[in-house]
Every structure is written in C-alpha cells, then in structure tokens.
C-alpha cells in the first residue's frame, strides 16, 4: 500500500481493475463484473478470499500493485540481491579480483568483506566491480580511499561505524551506480562530497544522524534516480531547489524524518519526482502550492503525520497521482472536492482519519480508484464504486452483516432467549415463594430485572443483525449515530453495572452474617430499599453519562456495531477511554475483588466453626457442598469479569486488540452472569427446589383425589427462605425470629454449616 | 577429530592433467568462515600456495597456475578437488591440502599428509 | 603480489640456546603473519599465528612479534626436537605466499 513496501515485498504484478473501465460487461453502482461472465457481484464479494464468482475472477487482481512499483520495477530487481546472504549473482565464479583479503569472499569481480571486522577501506586490485563492506568496524572514509576503483559500481556500507566522510572520500568512483550508506553515524554531508558520481543511481543513506541537507549536498548527481535519506533527524527541507544538481530524480523517500513543514520552492526542481515518501514525518502543515511542481508525481504518501487541515487545491496539479496516502494524520475535515482533480487515483489510504462529514461526492469524481482504505468499514458505503475496499470488517461486523459471525448471529438469540427466560421466570416464580424474608427476595427480583436488561440488549442486537442482513455497510455508519444504539449500549452497560453492584450488595450483606455474626444488624426495609435505590441510579448515571455530553464522550456507544465500550480506540477521546476505565477497571474490578475476598472469608469462617463440629463426616459432606456452591459462584463471576478486565488493561497498554473480541465478549461472556444469575441465586437453592417438589406432591395429590371425587387444598407454603441459610432445626422454624438471614447469627457455630447446603 | 588426506597418481607424463582429491574427515567443508587450499612444495624447495576454495564455493588462485587450474568441490562427500592441466617437470613436487580459517592471520591450521607427483616422460 | 623474504637460507645454533629468524613483507600486511615448522618428511605444523599468537599445544619457547613489515620468530631455548624448517606466510591478501624457509641446524 505504501511505496516503502516495494522495498520489502516483491510485488506481484497485474491488471487493474477500475470500475466498469474496459469491460464489457456494466454493472450497476457498488456491483463488480466476474470477469468475462455477464454475473455482477456485490463490491463486499470481491477480494473477500471467496470465490464468488466461481470463476476466481472476484479475487483476482486484488493486490494494491499501484505506485511507481509499476513503471520502475526495473530499478528494484537487484536490491533484493542485496539483502540476501551474499550480493552475487553467478552461482560461484572463481575470484578475478587479484589481490583480496584473506577474510573476504570474492567470487567474479565482486568482494564481500561483511563481518570481518575491517576497521578502515581495504586494498585490494583496481578491477573490483562491487565491494561489501557490511558490518565493519569503520569510522571514517578518509580521502581517496577509492581511488583506485574507476570499475567499482556498487559500494555497499552498511551497518557500520561511519561518523565522518572526507569530501574527497568518493573521488574516482566514476562508474560507481548504487551506494549504500544505511545504518551508520552520519551526521552531516560536506556539499561536493558526491561531486565524482556522475553515474550515480541508487544513494541510501538510511538511519544516519543527518539534521540537515540543502542543494549543493547533491552537487555532481546529475544521474541519480533514487535518493532514500529514511529516519535521519532532518528538521526542515531546503527552502531552495532540492533538486537542483539531481534532473533526474524519480524517487525520494523522507520517512521517518522530524520534518515540520514543506515550503513552495523545496520541489520546484524536482519535476521528474515520481514517488514522494514523507509518512511518519512532523508535518503539521501544507501550502496550497507545495506539490504544484511535481507534475509526474505517481505515488505521494503523506501518511503518520500531524496534518490537521488539508488546502482545499492542494493536490490540484497531481494530474499523474495513482496512489495517495493520507493515514494516520489529524485531519479534521476532508473538503467534498478535495480529490476531484485526482482522475487516475487508483488507491486511495485514509486509514485512522476520522471523516465527520463523509460522502459520496467526495469519492465520486475518482473513477480509477480501485482500492480505498478506511478507518472504519462502515466508511466503504460512501465508496461503492470502488472495487477493493479494506477494512471490510472491525471483527464485529461485516459488509454484510452487523453481527459477521455465523455463530455469533445463532447465539445472540440463544443467550438472549435464556437470560430472558431465566430471569423472568425468576420473577415471575417469587410470589409462590411467599418468603418471610421480602428484602432479600426484593433484591433478588433487582437482580434479575437487571439481569433481564442483558437479554433484551441481546435481542435488539441480534433484531437490527436481522433487520441489516446482507447489506449492513449501507446502514452502519447511521446505526452507530443513531440513538437506538446509544440506547441499547446504555442499556447494556446500565444491566451490567447494577449487576455488579447488586451482587456485590449481596454479598457483603452474607459476608458480615457469616464472619461477624455477633456484629449482625438486622438491615431494616428502609435501609435495602434505599440501597438498591441507590445503586439503581448509579447504574442509570454510569449509563446516561456518555450520552450527556457529545463533546467530551464523542461517539461513546457506537464505535462498533454492538454498541459495547469495551475497549478503546487511539483516536477515542481521552475523557472516554479514562471513563472506561474507571467502570471496568475501577467499579467492576473492585466489585470483583470484594465478592471474590468476601466469599473466601465466608468460607474459612464456616471451615473454621466446623472444626468443633462433633459429626465429620456429615460436617465434610456438608462443608463440601458449601465450597461447591461458593466455587461457582465465583467461578462464574470471574468467568465473566476476568476476560473483560485483561481486554480493557491490554487495551490500556495500546496492546492491539483483535475487534472480535469484542463481539465474542458482549455476546458469549458479559451475560454469563445475567444468564446464570437466576440458576444460582434461586433456581438451585433448596427452598426453590422444596416449592418445586411441593408443587409436584401437590399436583400428584390432586390428581389422585381427583381420580377419587375429593376435593384438594393445597399446603400453604409458608416457610422461610434464607438463602444461603436453608436448613433449619424444625424447632427453630419460627415466623417471628427470622425475618432476614442475619438473624441465623443467633444459631450456633456449627448449624452455621448447615444452612448453606 | 580433523582428518586430511589427500590422494592422486604418484607418475604422470608432461602434458598430461592432474588430478587430486583431498578428503576431509570430522568437519564440514561448508563450516562457515573456513577455507580448503592446495600448496605443493617441490623437491628441496620451499612452500608454494596454489589455491583455495571457501565454505561459500568462492575459488581463487595464484596467477602463477590459475590459468591451467581449477578447484572444485562435493560437499555432499565432503572432498575437495584440484585439477591441473598441462603439466610439466616443474610440477615435480609433495602436494598437500590444509584448512584455513578466513580471519586474517590465521595461517593454516591443519594439513593432510600429502601426495607425491612426479612428473616424467 | 606480496613477496615474503627470510633473508636467512640456514641458522647454526646449539641446544639451549636463543635464535631468532627474521622475515620482511613487500608491503604492509598489519599482523596477518603465521610461522609453520617443517622437518623432513613431514607436513608443515602451525606454530604462530597473527603474528604473535601460539598455536594451541605449542610450547612457550616459541614466540613471534612484528606488525607491518618486518616479523621475528624466536625460540628462546633451542632443543634437539626443534631442528627443521621454518617457514613464515603472510595470511593478508591473496595470493598467499610464503617466505622462502630457513634451516634451523646445529653448529
């Protein structure tokens, strides 16, 4: 995509594809022709690693191939010869150098001294063709240390020491076409130094030290093609002819550089440039005239810069541009005619630019374009005459589909439809548990309600995945706007919050029972109704927050097709991602830790009380049945939480998260406690069971008496439910002294066991 | 342990070619960073290098010979080959083949016992 | 090509005693010098290397020095075992050669 990679990848070569251009066959808008068939396809088909067309021609010709990769492969053939183990190209000629040091390798007339420890330019015959000189010990060329070599056409010095170069250090190297000079210590170039290079080609001076160049620098390279000076520290560029002494320069790559701003006069020489490299630069501004001269240019990459506005003409001369690379700059706002002067654009990188006012215009004038890269796929609806569109998923949604996976789309019903059901049926059940002990039940139906807010979540997710089938891209961007999504991703987090915090409630009001029993205060009805009050309205304030304020929170919901803030982007704002933070890192986080502490010290405290138990073997049967049901509990709870806080603390590293986490997290692992809530909080408990197996005897008993004429009346089922506390002395089954599970503080030690079977 | 030997025809007639083999035995011809080279010494006389090949396949050779000789190897039987064309009385000499590792200074570390030529019509 | 000279054909010396044999370079070759010891009917044995490095399981006696031009091989007390050949090699730049030999003899 950028034209540094030609340097590293061996590109494939191809056909363009641009749209509806030289084919017979049309097809309508954001369709794409199989070829030769008259089938049209869909532009999220082609280069999707499927074969749609079944006759590969879809997945044909999908490599970005554009830039000057093209017209001047010719000039790359050999510097992949280079980078391999020894820069010969015969097999292994005998050495027709005469004199060769003993530590080097010679085959023809080529000399590879890498690695050998050489600390100065050695001696060797005048007929040496290429010398390699590669991780040496040299500091300096000293003058005329290649004199001798009038033959000499590529001198390789990379990687060693090199501080100083004596103007005179490349005088007589008159046939001399590629020098490469990368991985030293160079931090200035006397001007006149390259004065004998008439035939210079290649100059690569990569990671140096050098701060600054000007015109006469290249004063004698009236042959050069390509200059590459990546990662050096220059600051500025010449406010003077940089090509100057360099007709014939075809390509310059700056990147890497701390570059500020580009003047009007820097490339008013430079009319043969035809790839300009300046990413990962400090660009933070550009005059409207800056590229006018470069009216030859193929490949401009401006990528990783601190470009905020881009001059509304400013690409206006590029009449030759076929590969554009924007990426990675602040710009603020992309002009709708901002590319029309671009008509053999062919790729087209806006990578991590949010485009606030996106549309179709702005695309539409560039008919050539056959591959455009976004910060988010949704963007590629605004380019549907563009046959290669990336990214084509944020690993959440696809082209096609909000929800991409095929299990996740199934699923998203399922987990809904049991969190749903189970919760509901939990609540609907809790009259018939006509329970002495109201509060409890009363934070249990809290829960579940909240518990339910998850499964409708899950529904209207998998209701818009429905809704969108198989053409999600045109929708994507107004659903991540639009207030249903921030109403459903606040109803998400609104159900996980007050989750979190119920069941924290829960368990701190169990953990000081069980541990402190004597300390027990009976907690009046006034008291948990104004704490699930309250905790209630923390999670509406959590929730609503983001939606408050636009400004500080940006798009806080919909920055994916969920509408989950599970973790954040770099260019989300700050205010988001710290308030991220602070809900899954700060207010989960510490939840968890008090529901996982507070469950061990229940735990050791009932263990410790059963040591002077005087039946073991019933107290170990029991005690085992107790650690089972605390296990899952917090086995469940960390099943749920533990990967939210690695995604959310590896995100905070800027560790690159894959996107479906995402999905696979809000669909599969942040309802396990919403879907299991009810299981293990009620359904499983003995009282439930008992209702259950009285409703069952009852049911029986009816339609015996039925069968016999009589008439039935069912057992009231008055008893009194303390989860955990449910087994009780019969004798100590008194309406009057339990109304809350605290009060089982007043049962001795060891019946402290019992209760939580 | 680093063997040499080297093998060839004790009597060979003017004009004829001459062909060595060096065998080595307990290192690999093609150990990065060593040489294998030929010097013969003629009766009476002292030490003359002839030429070398490296662990890459790079050969080189003394221009007093390089035009009639080459140097070959089969690193797959670990030998080294040297072949001369056109000899003469003055070939007269105890051929041996050594390793060199290619640092310079190094010299030669190991040496084959050695081969006798004579050449005589 | 550099050319290597011993300027002694043949040394006398007695057992017990120093001798040093000399060799100059045609040209500078740093320290890239070796010194072999030949006796009859034998390969040449590696006794120095780089000039003044000693070759593993060579007995301290034997020392080399020099650098650029001009090296010395000393034996610093002569034993019967030591009568032979001697012979020093530039190991700089091809073509490697050789310096004529000197014959270490007893008076």
């Known amino acids: 995509m950028t034209s540094g990679s030609v340097f590293f990848y061996i590109l494939i070569f191809g056909k363009y594809f641009s749209h509806g251009g030289g084919q017979d066959v049309k097809c309508s808008l954001g369709y794409f022709p199989c070829g030769n068939i008259t089938k049209c396809l869909p532009q999220l088909l082609h280069c999707n690693g499927v074969d749609d067309c079944g006759n590969q021609a879809d997945e044909d010709n999908c490599g970005d191939n554009n830039g000057w990769s093209l017209q001047f492969d010719k000039y790359f053939a050999s510097y992949y010869k280079m980078t391999s183990q020894y820069p010969f190209e015969a097999e292994t000629p005998e050495c027709l150098v005469g004199s060769v040091p003993v530590q080097c390798l010679c085959q023809g007339l080529e000399l590879d001294c890498d690695e050998t420890n050489l600390r100065a330019v050695p001696s060797v015959s005048s007929n040496v063709t290429a010398m390699s000189l590669q991780w040496n010990l040299i500091r300096k060329l000293p003058p005329d240390c290649f004199k001798n070599y009038h033959d000499l056409q590529k001198l390789y010095l990379q990687n060693n020491k090199i501080t100083s170069i004596s103007i005179y250090a490349f005088r007589g190297l008159n046939s001399l076409t590629k020098l490469y000079l990368s991985h030293n210590r160079i931090t200035f170039l006397k001007p006149g130094v390259f004065e004998d290079l008439h035939r210079l080609e290649w100059l690569i001076i990569e990671d140096n030290h050098l701060s600054r160049i000007s015109p006469p620098t290249f004063y004698g390279l009236n042959s050069l093609i390509l200059l590459v000076l990546m990662n050096n520290v220059l600051t500025r560029l010449p406010d003077k002819p940089l090509c100057q002494h360099m007709p014939r320069l075809h390509w310059l790559d700056l990147e890497g550089n701390h570059i500020h701003n580009l003047r009007n006069l820097t490339f008013i020489s430079c009319s043969n440039l035809t790839v300009l490299v300046m990413r990962k630069n400090k660009i933070n501004h550009l005059n409207e005239n800056t590229f006018a001269p470069l009216q030859k240019l193929d490949e401009l990459d401006l990528g990783s810069n601190k470009i905020e506005n881009l001059p509304p003409l400013i690409f206006k001369d590029l009449k030759e541009l076929s590969q554009l690379n924007l990426s990675y700059n602040p710009i603020q706002k992309i002009q709708a005619n901002q590319f029309d002067y671009l008509v053999k654009l062919k790729s087209l990188s806006l990578e991590g630019i949010e485009i606030s006012n996106i549309q179709q215009r702005m695309f539409r004038p560039l008919m050539n374009l056959s591959h455009i890269y976004f910060k988010k796929f949704q963007y590629c609806g605004y380019a549907p005459h563009v046959r290669s569109c990336k990214p084509n998923t944020d690993g959440i949604s696809s082209l096609e589909n909000l929800l991409a996976s095929i299990i996740q789309r199934v699923f998203v019903w399922v987990v809904s439809a049991v969190t749903c059901f189970g919760n509901i049926f939990v609540i609907c059940m809790r009259p018939y548990i006509r329970s002495e002990n109201k509060l409890y039940a009363m934070s249990i139906i809290s829960l579940c309600c909240a518990d339910c807010l998850m499964g409708i979540y899950l529904f209207v997710i998998g209701g818009f995945d429905l809704k969108f089938r198989g053409e999600y891209n045109k929708h994507a961007q107004l659903w991540m706007e639009s207030t249903h999504c921030q109403l459903v991703g606040s109803l998400a987090i609104l159900s996980t919050e007050v989750s979190v915090l119920l069941l924290t409630f829960l368990t701190l009001e169990k953990y000081i029972c069980i541990v402190y029993p004597f300390r027990c205060v009976r907690p009046g009805k006034c008291r948990t109704i104004t704490v699930l009050i309250l905790i209630w309205i923390t999670g509406f304030i959590v929730a609503f927050i983001p939606l408050s304020n636009k400004e500080f929170f940006k798009n806080y919901y919909g920055t994916n097709g969920v509408c989950f803030p599970l973790h954040s982007e770099d260019t989300e704002s700050i205010g988001a991602q710290i308030y991220s933070v602070a809900i899954f890192l700060g207010i989960n986080l510490a939840a968890f830790i008090i529901i996982v502490f507070s469950y061990g010290s229940m735990f050791y405290s009932v263990h410790q009380s059963a040591i002077t138990a005087t039946e073991i073997r019933n107290q170990v049967k029991k005690e085992m049945i107790l650690a089972k049901r605390f296990f899952f509990i917090v086995f469940t709870d960390a099943l749920c939480w533990i990967p939210i806080f690695v995604v959310k603390f590896l995100s905070l590293l800027q560790v690159e998260i894959p996107g479906t986490i995402t999905s696979w997290v809000v669909i599969f692992i942040l309802p396990i406690n919403s879907a299991l809530n009810p299981i293990l909080y009620t359904l499983t408990t003995r009282p439930f069971k008992e209702m259950i197996h009285r409703f069952w005897y009852n049911y029986r008993q009816r339609k015996s008496m039925d069968s016999k004429g009589q008439k039935t009346y069912a057992p009231s089922f008055i008893w009194v439910e303390m989860w955990p506390l449910q087994e009780m002395p019969p004798e100590l089954m008194k309406p009057d002294l339990f109304t809350y599970p605290c009060e089982m503080s007043l049962i001795s030690q060891s019946t402290r066991l019992n209760s939580y079977s | 342990q680093i063997q040499l030997k080297e093998s060839g025809p004790v009597v060979i007639k003017p004009s004829q070619s001459l062909s060595l083999t060096c065998i080595v035995s307990?290192?690999?011809?093609?150990?990065?960073?060593?040489?294998w080279n030929w010097i013969r010494q003629p009766p009476g006389k002292g030490l003359e290098w002839m030429g070398r090949?490296?662990?890459?396949?790079?050969?080189y050779y003394s221009p007093s010979i390089k035009s009639r000789s080459t140097i070959s190897r089969d690193t797959s039987l670990n030998k080294i080959f040297f072949q001369l064309n056109s000899v003469t009385s003055e070939d007269t000499a105890m051929y041996y083949c050594?390793?060199?590792?290619?640092?310079?200074?190094?010299?030669?570390?190991?040496w084959g016992q050695g081969t006798t030529l004579t050449v005589s019509s | 090509d550099i050319v290597m000279t011993q300027s002694h054909k043949f040394m006398s010396t007695s057992v017990g005693d120093r001798v040093s044999i000399t060799c100059k370079a045609s040209?500078?070759?740093?320290?890239?010098v070796a010194w072999y010891q030949q006796k009859p009917g034998q390969s040449p044995k590696l006794l120095i290397y780089?000039?003044?490095y000693r070759y593993t399981g060579v007995p301290d006696r034997f020392t080399g020095s020099g650098s650029g031009t001009d090296f010395t091989f000393t034996i610093s007390s002569v034993q019967s075992e030591d009568l032979a050949v001697y012979y020093c090699?530039?190991?700089?730049?091809?073509?490697?050669?050789f310096g004529a030999g000197t014959k270490l003899e007893l008076k």
């Open positions: 050594s390793r060199e590792k290619q640092i310079a200074g190094t010299g030669f570390d190991y």
């Open positions: 307990g290192f690999s011809i093609t150990s990065s960073r060593f040489c």
């Open positions: 090949i490296c662990y890459e396949g790079s050969r």
């Open positions: 040209q500078d070759v740093s320290t890239a």
């Open positions: 780089s000039s003044s």
């Open positions: 090699q530039q190991h700089y730049s091809t073509p490697l050669t």
